[in-house]
């Protein structure tokens, strides 16, 4: 296990998950480490404690390795971390990657007011409802501007999005979560549609795929509590 | 579905040895990471040793030059050697499985394991 020392000379590895920081509960979620091609092992930590290791073979590329989760629950959701041995020296830490699993418990409904069919500048406003009782809500748009917003609600969140242009359109989800790593499963998509303005802009968007292994993510919030943590939503993390 | 069996557990006296197997089902075994926890009364589960797919191997500070893991691909059995075995090392023995896991991947968190065996008592006293 890795010591700390005074020492960690060695650069920060990268670290990023595929298909996605997003996984669905009972399904495989890989997280890659790069580091150096001197690199004689990786250490995955996982809440600050251990959690695997591996120890590159010399006839594959050194630099990078994979750490498979068969198996995503509430119990392996949360903030990886990575680091890399050459020699006697120890990297530092790479930045946190945070998995979130999705899929637990139940369903929210998403859905829009006054109507998903706005014209460009009118007032808009979401609102995700969840049976179960939760602690925070987010909102999620596919594609687009790639960000998410939470909310703190118990049952039900609103999320005014104000006068809406144009990038405001495309399809949303909200979950419902029962820890920041532990969330609900999806609703059914909302796509808001907007009219007006100098071009016809009610296309829905072109790709039509609704798989949160296609969705990519920045955390984006208005809550004081909250900072932005691109971080937390990048697939790779290397700032 | 894996199904994990451990046998080999008993009494022992200090400074003894035990050898501990731990026999999988199903045709998977060739791709499952395995590991060995046990815990002791009264106190957390703890991690012990682990070995890849490929054989690597992993140990904790406290049995490392005295436990060795090993496994038989052929016989779908992970096994562990325990020597010089102290009053401190009386626990349930558990074996787990990663299944399926890749590369070298050596799991030293429980969170990782998705098998569990029922476990062996191991009692180490005079």
């Known amino acids: 296990q890795r010591i700390n020392t005074e020492k960690e000379t060695l650069p920060k590895p990268i670290i990023w998950a595929k298909p996605s920081i997003m996984v669905t509960n009972g399904n495989s979620v890989n997280i890659w480490c790069q580091g150096a091609q001197s690199a004689s092992e990786y250490q995955l930590y996982f809440e600050g404690s251990f959690f695997a290791l591996e120890r590159p073979k010399p006839s594959r590329s050194m630099n990078k390795v994979r750490f498979f989760i068969s198996q995503m629950t509430s119990h392996t959701a949360g903030i990886y971390t990575c680091f890399y041995q050459s020699g006697e020296l120890w990297s530092k830490s790479s930045n946190p990657l945070k998995l979130v699993v999705t899929g637990l418990y139940d369903t929210p409904n998403l859905w829009v007011y006054p109507r998903p069919e706005v014209t460009l500048g009118e007032n808009v406003t979401f609102f995700c409802q969840l049976k179960t009782a939760t602690s925070k809500f987010f909102l999620l748009k596919e594609r687009g501007s790639n960000h998410i917003q939470n909310k703190y609600g118990n049952i039900q969140a609103e999320f005014p999005m104000g006068p809406v242009t144009r990038a405001h359109r495309g399809t949303y989800r909200c979950f419902g979560s029962y820890n920041d790593y532990a969330w609900s499963f999806p609703s059914e998509p909302v796509t808001l549609l907007i009219t007006g303005g100098v071009e016809n802009s009610s296309l829905a968007p072109t790709d039509p795929t609704s798989s949160l292994d296609y969705w990519e993510f920045d955390l984006s919030t208005n809550e004081s509590g909250l900072q932005k943590d691109s971080a937390f939503w990048d697939h790779t993390t290397q700032n | 579905e894996v199904q994990l069996v451990e046998s080999g557990g008993g009494e022992v006296q200090p400074g003894g040895s035990l050898r501990l197997s731990c026999a999988a089902s199903?045709?998977?075994?060739?791709?499952?990471?395995m590991g060995w926890f046990r815990q002791a009364p009264g106190k957390e589960r703890e991690f012990v040793a682990a070995?890849?797919?490929?054989?690597?191997?992993y140990y904790a500070d406290s049995v490392k030059g005295r436990f060795t893991i090993s496994r038989d691909n052929a016989k779908n059995t992970v096994y562990l050697q325990m020597s010089s075995l102290r009053a401190e090392d009386t626990a349930v023995y558990y074996c787990?499985?990663?299944?399926?896991?890749?590369?070298?991947?050596?799991?030293?968190?429980?969170?990782?394991?998705?098998?569990w065996g029922q476990g062996t008592l191991v009692t180490v006293k005079p």
């Open positions: 787990a499985a990663v299944v399926p896991t890749y590369g070298n991947n050596i799991y030293v968190h429980s969170a990782a394991y998705n098998y």
């Open positions: 199903g045709r998977t075994f060739a791709s499952a990471a």
């Open positions: 070995i890849s797919r490929s054989g690597d191997t």
